[in-house]
């Protein structure tokens, strides 16, 4: 805006206008005329920087003339009216339409007044995120993949993770000319602790009101990690039966549990029930090491636990298990 009292006419337009590939967009351009100022506009002209000639002209007496009549249209200019609004609509936006345009009013007696507008041609990307299922490799591998397809300009991808790791981002031409597909991989050394945890892919693009967040639940395949619980070192003779539990974490899930001892098969007082081992009351002290062997698709792992059943005052203990 000019300072008050200058009495000058001013062309008003945004410095930048975004439009979407394939859509239509209006390049707004208005002549602001102070209240007392007399002006007469005989012509509106749109031209593109670096190109000779005009792409659109509206003449007071001849009306509109377009370089591409099917793609251009003056929004408000009409014959027989004051020419104050030079806004131009462009249809079927193409990548090559991006650039600097000049909107010019030929006004009398103030002369030609113009303004430049930068047209940004955008393409809204489609975003997907997916897990990359991995095994324990011992070295960094991609565990999640985030893809922003067909963006213009290219989308910006970042990752949020509490697990450590690093991104590996690449770009490739999109399906439509001038668009870009961005692929970002989240890379880390797989471990069983990572399995089931999540990382978040954040995609930023000027066509979005706010960043898009895509959460990926990670999958790491690993053989069973086995431990045995249920024994508290305080088991005594002539007390109630007790239970040992074979605790196994694995992906995929365990397919089988096998109980044994270091001496071979289970003794008669030990009965296997899947992941649990039932220890019946015994009448003499024992000192036995139990083995639980757990199998899944990736292999078998086992854990050992030595159980001692001791002599002791039964009145103080209600069973062989502290549970």
């Amino acid at each position: 805006w000019p300072p008050p009292g200058t009495g000058d006419i001013v062309v008003q337009a945004p410095t930048q206008v975004p439009g979407f590939l394939g859509d239509s967009v209006t390049l707004p351009c208005y002549l602001q005329v102070p209240g007392m100022e007399e002006t007469h506009v005989s012509q509106l002209t749109w031209s593109r920087h670096g190109e000779s000639g005009s792409m659109a002209v509206f003449h007071q007496t001849q009306g509109p003339n377009y370089s591409e009549p099917k793609r251009l249209e003056f929004v408000a200019a009409r014959l027989g009216t004051e020419l104050r609004d030079a806004s131009l609509r462009m249809f079927g936006l193409r990548v090559e339409d991006e650039g600097n345009y000049t909107c010019l009013f030929v006004a009398f007696p103030q002369g030609s007044r113009s303004v430049d507008i930068w047209l940004r041609v955008l393409a809204k990307p489609q975003n997907t995120a997916e897990v990359q299922k991995v095994q324990l490799t011992g070295k960094p591998v991609p565990v999640a993949r985030c893809v922003s397809t067909g963006g213009r300009p290219p989308a910006h991808i970042t990752w949020h993770s509490d697990l450590g790791g690093m991104p590996n981002t690449s770009q490739a031409p999109g399906f439509l000319s001038g668009t870009v597909t961005v692929t970002s991989l989240w890379i880390l050394v797989p471990s069983s602790q990572v399995d089931g945890k999540s990382v978040t892919c954040k995609v930023e693009h000027e066509s979005f009101e706010k960043p898009q967040l895509l959460t990926v639940n990670l999958t790491v395949y690993y053989p069973p990690e086995v431990s045995i619980s249920g024994y508290d070192n305080n088991w005594y003779l002539s007390q109630n039966e007790a239970t040992l539990t074979c605790d196994a974490r694995s992906n995929p899930e365990p397919t089988g549990y096998n109980w044994s001892t270091t001496m071979g098969p289970l003794p008669p007082f030990a009965v296997a029930q899947g992941a649990q081992l039932l220890i019946r009351p015994v009448d003499k002290p024992i000192n036995t090491t139990f083995i639980c062997n757990v199998t899944n698709a990736l292999g078998a792992r086992q854990a050992e636990l030595t159980v001692q059943v001791k002599e002791g005052p039964p009145s103080e203990h209600s069973g062989m298990s502290s549970n």
Partner: antibody, heavy 121, light 109 residues
Framework: QVQLVQSGAEVKKPGASVKVSCKAS????????ISWVRQAPGQGLEWIAW????????NYNQKFTGRVTMTTDTSTSTAYMELRSLRSDDTAVYYC??????????????WGQGTTVTVSS | QAVVTQEPSLTVSPGGTVTLTCRSS?????????ANWVQQKPGQAFRGLIG???NRAPGVPARFSGSLLGDKAALTLSGAQPEDEAEYYC?????????FGGGTKLTVL
């Protein structure tokens, strides 16, 4: 070349009207702005009005509003200025001037030779 | 009613430089006043020299230049020629009308 040729001298009585013509040649008449200016004997130049030849759109000096009418005939590329209710102080040389564009601004480019209007009883 | 004031007369030596000024009664002259300068030689039609403060008309010698000088519009003639002897008028725009100055009679002597 661009030329503006005005009609001949006029002698009018007070209260009468006068219509001065300005025939243009050498350029596209319909896309031009033409101003009318007068100079009374011993006085300075005084702007009366302008007209856009293509549409007949006008802007008058408020001093003359209601007494002056500007028109154009695009078929003959001629601009007209009619001044009514003539008074003795309307005695002056009346000029038409075509505005041209230089750079991004207008200027008083080409002038007619002037038409002397004498108002006398 | 705005009044536009010019020097009634000025004299310049051939090859010399002279500046004609144009003052507005309403305050400082700005680019919004669209200062124009026209020339009238004795017995000849008016001729436009400058438009829009500083835009020289086609065919006008480069020795003529328009500008704003302080709070006035100015026409500077650098390297005056005998044929530049003429009456020079300044014209200012005031939102809805043009106002002419009284003219400056320039003598090249």
């Amino acid at each position: 070349q661009v030329q503006l040729v005005q009609s001949g001298a006029e002698v009018k009585k007070p209260g009468a009207s006068v219509k001065v013509s300005c025939k243009a040649s050498g350029y596209t008449f319909t896309s031009s702005y033409i101003s009318w200016v007068r100079q009374a004997p011993g006085q300075g130049l005084e702007w009366i009005a302008w007209i856009y030849a293509g549409t007949g759109d006008t802007n008058y000096n408020q001093k003359f509003t209601g007494r002056v009418t500007m028109t154009t005939d695009t078929s003959t590329s001629t601009a007209y200025m009619e001044l009514r209710s003539l008074r003795s102080d309307d005695t002056a040389v009346y000029y038409c001037a075509r505005h041209g564009m230089t750079g991004r601004g207008w200027y008083f480019a080409v002038w007619g030779q002037g038409t002397t209007v004498t108002v006398s009883s | 009613q705005a009044v536009v004031t010019q020097e009634p007369s000025l004299t310049v030596s051939p090859g010399g430089t002279v500046t004609l000024t144009c003052r507005s009664s309403t305050g400082a002259v700005t680019t919004s006043n669209l200062a124009n300068w026209v020339q009238q030689k004795p017995g000849q039609a008016f001729r436009g020299l400058i438009g829009h403060t500083n835009n020289r008309a086609p065919g006008v010698p480069a020795r003529f230049s328009g500008s704003l000088l302080g709070d006035k519009a100015a026409l500077t003639l650098s390297g005056a020629q005998p044929e530049d002897e003429a009456e020079y008028y300044c014209i200012l725009w005031y939102s809805n009308k043009f106002v002419f100055g009284g003219g400056t009679k320039l003598t090249v002597l």
